[in-house]
């Protein structure tokens, strides 16, 4: 399988919500000893290799705000340390895995990354990530919305 | 905060069979895999099978297959280990180990403090 | 089985010495676990995945290898870094673990 990021770019005022979206292209193994852990980190632009670095989000680390479930299962972060920073991972039975971020600062601004690891009992098979870039802008009315694009074509539409 | 507490040191005769236990708290112990390693002074750490909680499914050493038979019961998170037939040999001491999945590489993540089980005449 | 063999069984260093224990495979893996171990406790999770330190693990700790070889190395041993250290494989059953390396300070 393959991790695809339907919008490399959100822009956002401060103050909303936005969420940051990975989708599982291809295959996916749903035998009962496969499972599969997801996250979610910030990172820089490396030179060699993006998403190679590791930041926490508004302090949490990637193992903060895992999910660990079944190919066939939905999950979502339901312990409170992750929605006590206004966060939330989810994924669901289509591919989609995403994290929520409430009540965007400027300090949210920057590149994150979404990793996603099939388990084969207890083996760690198959390592695969997506990366997107956050831009949160200053003075915008509340009433304003995301804009989540393709940082290669114009287009650009809503985001939630 | 994940504890595994087992149960305490036992004095066994030869012959007669063993239950140990490990309580799991501060995660979903169903989901998790419970491990249970043998250590024997000298002999290092040894794998001896393991049971996901949740569905009862186990894998065995074949080396401990009829020695070791593991049960857990999710409405207490406990996991159990019964050891039939008691030799000198199982003289060790026993460790359950919570499977935890960390930046996607499952471990022995957890360890319960061991308990000792001495056979003797 | 995949029978892990490290070496030395036992090693003896100075505080602020470099040291490097080994574990080899019988047969090739992706990656290998460390756990450290005192006596009188149980073993700690230690390096993960080859070359990762697990949460709390000091940076002096370092992991390497591939294939049939892997290295646990300390770059300035301490006292308190006394302890047996275990390599783990967990790519076949039966899960197994290396021999240990007894780490002893002078």
């Known amino acids: 399988f393959k991790v695809a990021t339907p919008y490399s770019l959100y822009v956002c005022p401060e103050g909303q919500n936005v969420t940051l979206t990975c989708r599982l292209l291809g295959p996916v193994d749903k035998g009962h000893d496969v499972t599969f852990y997801k996250t979610w980190y910030r990172s820089s632009r490396g030179e060699v290799q993006t998403c190679s670095e590791r930041r926490p989000i508004r302090n949490l680390t990637f193992q903060d705000l895992h999910l660990h479930h079944g190919g066939h299962q939905a999950a979502n972060t339901s312990h409170d340390l992750a929605q006590r920073h206004g966060l939330e991972s989810a994924s669901d039975h289509h591919g989609n895995f995403s994290i929520t971020m409430r009540n965007l600062t400027l300090l949210d601004s920057g590149l994150y990354c979404c990793l996603v690891v099939e388990i084969r009992h207890h083996h760690s098979e198959h390592r695969v990530h997506g990366a997107m870039e956050l831009q949160v802008q200053a003075g915008k009315g509340s009433g304003s919305t995301c804009m989540a694009s393709n940082e290669q074509d114009s287009d650009s539409i809503t985001a939630a | 905060q994940v504890q595994l507490q087992q149960s305490g040191a036992e004095l066994m005769k030869p012959g007669a069979s063993v239950k140990i236990s490990c309580k799991a708290t501060?995660?979903?112990?169903?989901?998790?895999?419970i491990e249970w390693v043998k250590q024997r002074p000298g002999h290092g750490l040894e794998w001896i099978g393991e049971i996901l909680p949740g569905s009862g499914s186990t894998n065995y050493n074949e080396k401990f297959k009829g020695k070791a038979t593991f049960t857990a019961d999710t409405s207490s998170n406990t996991a159990y280990m019964q050891l039939s037939s008691l030799t000198s040999e199982d003289s060790a001491v026993y460790y359950c180990a919570g499977e935890e999945v960390y930046d996607g590489y499952p471990w022995f993540g957890y360890w319960g403090q061991g308990t000792l089980v001495t056979v003797s005449a | 089985q995949i029978v892990l063999s490290q070496s030395p069984a036992i090693l003896s260093a100075s505080p602020g010495e470099k040291v490097t224990m080994t574990c080899r495979a019988s047969?090739?893996?992706?990656?290998m676990h460390w756990y450290q171990q005192k006596p009188g406790s149980s073993p700690k999770p230690w390096i993960y995945?080859?070359?990762n330190l697990a949460s709390g693990v000091p940076a002096r700790f370092s992991g390497s290898g591939s294939g049939t070889s892997y290295s646990l190395t300390i770059s300035r041993v301490e006292a308190e870094d006394a302890a047996t250290y275990y390599c783990q494989q967990w790519s076949s059953n039966p899960y197994t673990f290396g021999g240990g390396t007894k780490l002893e300070i002078k």
């Open positions: 995945a080859t070359s």
């Open positions: 047969s090739s893996l992706s990656y």
């Open positions: 501060g995660y979903t112990f169903s989901r998790y895999w």
